[in-house]
């Protein structure tokens, strides 16, 4: 062992360094001492640091790690951040889109229903909005209180405009009459499906995302312990009290004690990998039915086709619904909603410029791109912290915690550190309460991610319709279906590309669901089908 | 008011055939279904098919196959069933019916008897 | 096919007895997406036209008395008649709408003592 540079004999340097943690000199040697009562930086022979000192270098420490660890997530932490509120704001203004739409599809093709289904179709997408941001409503509910309130519409104002007003009383019968009936055949179902399937999985990625934030706050705010602070105190300062004011820690002997007080941390990285691939899983299949931009922007078309249903069977309705609705006392169904005031949400839409007039998939992609950067961020926290503080290259003529060594040499330091503190004791601990938590928060998350992912080929259930469609009135590729009907289906593809250049006002002529619109090629209500014993078509 | 009015009583001979009508009055049979209901004496009752006479699509029993043709006169407000190649087991009354949409059979023609021999 | 199953296939009652009547159906008969049971009950009195009583298993039709009353779900339905009079004298039929081909039940005939 080289034998220690003599020490400044009046701690001098050490005084002027310890000036800038704390002002005043009251704890400082102004000559080295025995320092017995030393507790981390335990002397060789005489140093220039007090028991005072120490535990200020301790707070030191401790201060530096925690901001050594936030300057470490920060680009993680603002990558996500930024996507969470880039995402919900872009999904807020699907859904504003996707209602302007079906309110136009009203506007242009039932002006007679305007004012009640701008209604209806706002507390529908209200309903949308607050179920994305995780509000505890039911998709299923949501569609029926929608077809619901349209059915007795519908049938007072277009099936049977002359309708005395004595007769508008049977709102709550035409209500019931709705689901009885199947008045608007398999639309509805297609419609939950759909909506139910597409805004589960946005709601799960938003929700993944603000759990990612949460996971980086929390690690971001860790307290280290008070063992880890010694260990950090000893590697950082404790060369200060021997005046070896220009020494480096050994980059092996960082590595060993970020280790140690990172352990708990770095328990997390199983399931922050986990998260990243099961995130990467579920972004890979929010398509097609998956796909609420997808969905939600070909609703109108399903609502109209769903319309036109219910008129081309308006003859065998009215004979039903005259014999149910005639005496609708008979018949007790939940109490329909007409607030006095409607609101028309008659607001011209501008959506916000969309850079590279991207998509919401594309960007979803690029975020996964950027995040598997990240997949290692926890396993590599160590490593990145001792390469962003200052560590001696090569582990040569460095500190070692306890002396200046010309190699560091990780044994040597475990055996001289024994008795001062035990590394495999911090390890053991285990993780903080706060760590053990996120992770059952990630594990929860990543549960989710998965029963969410999508499974690989068709992805809508083959038997949607108990009813016996007589054949798939979407063709071959039902997932791909949004307009609910065999020709003049529309297809939505690269929505947001062509919302970045769209101005879109209810007034538009052209509105979608103007012209070329689909009914379904087959009726399933007006129609005997041949096929044997299936679920019957007629009822 | 509703009503169905079936044609009277048919006496023919085996191997001939038939055709039995239910004209409707108080509604228009574009909108319901008109099926065809056979009662053996002292038997049960026993579906025959139907028919949607907007489109004239049509649904029957295999237990007819080729026995029953149901078909319908919007014109004359009118449903037909048309019996062929009978036998003595053809033998019944035969019931006209009004199906709304979503509901069963709630208006019944008075029936016709057709008798099967020789 | 989906089979009806009637019983009993007779039953002689007094007028002001109270009677039940059972169907069984060899499938369900309940549709998921609006909970309706898709059975009927008919009364057919000698001489006549069956007459539609009970639809969706338990809704009583237009003008038929309240003393009817249909209960069920599923695959096991009953028709019940309070304080049978002796207008009630009829062959009592289930029927299913919820498949093609419909079925009906070979029937109760129910006689007044």
């Known amino acids: 062992q080289p034998p220690p540079p003599p020490p400044d004999a009046t701690c001098h340097q050490v005084r002027s360094f310890f000036q800038r943690l704390q002002p005043g000199l009251k704890w400082v040697p102004e000559t080295p001492v025995p320092g017995s009562d030393l507790q981390v930086c335990l002397p060789k022979g005489p140093t220039c640091c007090s028991r005072k000192m120490e535990e200020k270098y301790q707070l030191t420490a401790r201060l530096n790690m925690e901001q050594l660890l936030q300057s470490a997530s920060m680009e993680l932490k603002f990558l996500i951040i930024q996507n969470a509120a880039v995402f919900q704001e872009a999904f807020e203004i699907v859904v504003r889109h996707a209602k302007n739409y079906t309110n136009a599809m009203f506007k242009n093709n039932y002006p007679s229903l305007t004012p009640q289904a701008f209604e209806f179709v706002g507390e529908f997408f209200t309903d949308v909005s607050l179920y994305i941001l995780g509000s505890d409503i039911n998709v299923d509910d949501m569609v029926n209180e929608l077809f619901d309130s349209l059915f007795p519409v519908i049938y007072t104002q277009l099936m049977n405009p002359g309708l005395p007003d004595s007769a508008l009383d049977i709102n709550e019968c035409l209500r019931g009459a709705r689901r009885d009936l199947k008045v608007f055949g398999n639309f509805p179902k297609l419609i939950m499906t759909q909506v139910s399937k597409s805004l589960q999985v946005t709601r799960i990625f938003l929700q993944a995302l603000n759990l990612g934030i949460e996971v980086i706050n929390t690690t971001d705010h860790l307290k280290f312990s008070k063992d880890c602070g010694r260990m950090l105190t000893r590697m950082w300062y404790c060369s200060y009290c021997q005046g070896l004011m220009m020494v480096k820690p050994c980059g092996g002997y960082c590595n060993v004690v970020m280790q140690g007080c990172m352990a708990g941390v770095v328990e997390i990285d199983k399931y922050w990998r986990e998260y990243i691939l099961s995130l990467e899983e579920l972004v890979n299949g929010m398509y097609r039915i998956y796909d609420m931009e997808n969905v939600l922007l070909g609703l109108f078309s399903t609502i109209h086709d769903s319309i036109q249903y219910v008129q081309k069977n308006a003859g065998k309705l009215t004979t039903t619904i005259g014999k149910l609705c005639a005496h609708s006392q008979q018949r007790q169904y939940r109490s329909a909603y007409y607030p006095e005031d409607l609101f028309i949400d008659k607001k011209v839409l501008k959506v916000a410029h969309v850079e590279h007039e991207e998509t919401l998939s594309s960007r979803r992609r690029e975020l996964i791109q950027k995040l598997k950067s990240f997949i290692s961020f926890y396993s590599a926290l160590p490593g990145y912290i001792c390469s962003h503080s200052p560590v001696a290259e090569n582990d040569t003529l460095c500190w070692n915690g306890q002396e200046l060594v010309e190699r560091y040499s990780q044994k040597a330091a475990r055996n001289g550190m024994k008795n001062q503190f035990n590394l495999h004791e911090l390890k053991m601990k285990g993780p903080e309460p706060v760590v053990s938590q996120i992770i059952d928060k990630l594990k929860h998350i990543n549960q989710l991610l998965r029963t969410m992912s999508m499974p690989k080929g068709r992805v809508l259930d083959k038997n949607l319709d108990e009813e016996g469609f007589e054949s798939g009135d979407c063709g071959d590729d039902e997932d791909e279906c949004i307009g609910g009907s065999g020709d003049g289906m529309i297809k939505v593809k690269n929505q947001l590309r062509f919302l970045a250049e769209l101005a879109y006002d209810l007034d538009v002529d052209d509105a979608p669901g103007n012209s070329q619109q689909a009914t379904p090629k087959d009726n399933e209500i007006s129609t005997f089908h041949n096929l044997g014993n299936v679920h019957s078509p007629l009822k | 008011e509703v009503q169905l009015q079936q044609s009277g009583a048919e006496h023919v001979k085996p191997g001939t055939s038939v055709r039995l009508s239910c004209t409707a009055s108080g509604f228009n049979i574009k909108d319901a279904y008109i099926h065809w209901v056979k009662q053996r004496p002292e038997q049960g009752l026993e579906w025959i098919g139907g028919?949607?006479?907007?489109?004239?699509?049509?649904e029957y029993d295999p237990k007819f196959p080729g026995k029953a043709t149901v078909v319908a006169d919007t014109s004359s407000n009118t449903a037909y069933l048309q019996l062929s190649s009978l036998t003595s087991e053809d033998t019944a009354v035969y019931y006209c019916a009004r199906r709304p949409l979503g509901l069963p059979f709630d208006y019944w023609g008075q029936g016709t008897t057709l008798t099967v021999s020789s | 096919d989906i089979v009806l199953s009637q019983s009993p296939s007779s039953l002689a009652v007094s007028v002001g007895e109270n009677v039940t009547m059972n169907c069984k159906s060899s499938q369900r008969l309940l549709d998921s997406s609006n909970q309706r049971n898709y059975l009927a009950w008919y009364q057919q009195k000698p001489g006549q036209s069956p007459q539609l009583l009970i639809f969706w298993a338990s809704t009583r039709e237009s003008g038929v008395p309240d003393r009817f009353t249909g209960s069920g779900s599923g695959t096991d339905f009953t028709l019940t008649i309070r304080s049978v009079k002796a207008e009630d004298l009829a062959v009592y039929y289930c029927?299913?709408?919820?498949?093609?081909?419909?079925?009906f039940g070979s029937g109760t005939k129910l006689e007044i003592k």
């Open positions: 028919i949607d006479p907007e489109n004239d699509n049509t």
């Open positions: 029927q299913q709408y919820y498949s093609y081909p419909f079925t």
